[in-house]
């Protein structure tokens, strides 16, 4: 029979044959052959693999470093990574929670809707049309675009959610 060019789900192609992938929580020891099944081994303590895989090494569980204000929210298993969170009163800087800050800043293009309190983090909101924020801040709201008209000027460059408008002199047309 023709050697396969594609394999079923949870299989992989190697040496012109389809081998079973290792299940989550296990790593590949040896590929299957004509006569043997794929050989897999469970990940060790503090290791994991979260997908059907052909990895020869398991991934290390994330370390929640207390020196960065991190603590374990959910202990990892052979199939899942450890989830970190911040000490009480502190907030993760990202989804991955790799470090902690007293309160998050709002990125350029976003303004502060509500300043952080002892119990809640900064609440950011996107700057609507007509407003901008060009800084990362835990306190500043979106600022309104400059009104060129009130200065007897015209808009030379449109504003965005991150930049103010640029005003310039009006063209004086001669009769």
């Amino acid at each position: 029979p023709e050697p396969p060019t594609a394999c079923r789900e949870k299989q992989y192609l190697i040496n012109s044959q389809c081998c079973s992938l290792c299940q989550p929580g296990q790593k590949l020891v040896s590929d299957c052959t004509e006569f043997t099944e794929t050989e897999c081994l469970p990940c060790g303590e503090s290791e994991f693999l979260d997908t059907w895989n052909r990895e020869t090494h398991c991934h290390q569980h994330k370390y929640c470093d207390p020196n960065l204000g991190l603590r374990v929210q959910q202990k990892g298993t052979s199939e899942t990574d450890t989830i970190c969170t911040c000490e009480e009163g502190w907030h993760c800087t990202s989804e991955a929670c790799e470090s902690c800050v007293l309160h998050r800043s709002c990125s350029p293009g976003f303004g502060v809707k509500q300043i952080a309190t002892g119990v809640s983090d900064t609440i950011c909101e996107p700057c609507p049309v007509g407003f901008f924020s060009n800084v990362s801040s835990a306190f500043e709201k979106c600022h309104p675009w400059t009104s060129c008209e009130t200065k007897d000027l015209v808009v030379q460059q449109a504003g965005t959610n991150k930049t103010d408008v640029v005003c310039g002199p009006q063209d004086r047309l001669r009769a």
Partner: nanobody, 116 residues
Framework: EVQLLASGGGLVQPGGSLRLSCAAS????????MIWVRQAPGKGLEWVSA????????YYADSVKGRFTISRDNSKNTLYLQMNSLRAEDTAVYYC?????????WGQGTLVTVSS
Amino acid sequence: EVQLLASGGGLVQPGGSLRLSCAASGFTFEEEEMIWVRQAPGKGLEWVSAISGSGGGTYYADSVKGRFTISRDNSKNTLYLQMNSLRAEDTAVYYCGKEPFRYDYWGQGTLVTVSS
């Protein structure tokens, strides 16, 4: 390396005043939003006041509004906190920092004790 050194703390009677200073180095001071935070004995960290890079925007926690004034001198890389009408509950170690205020770097604080 970022260095932030707060000074100016001390013992003061209720109703008295103090001016804290914070000498900053290791970063472009005028580009950074700066903050004062404090930690009372046995309590968590609480933000007190903040100021924008230009000094144009100032922000205060409700507990200090009308009594404390934050300012900065970008030519001297120095942040200030003028504290008036001090109360016993203002007793704490005061730290300065740049935003966002990170857990792993607080700098050196200065102790303010308000007591008669």
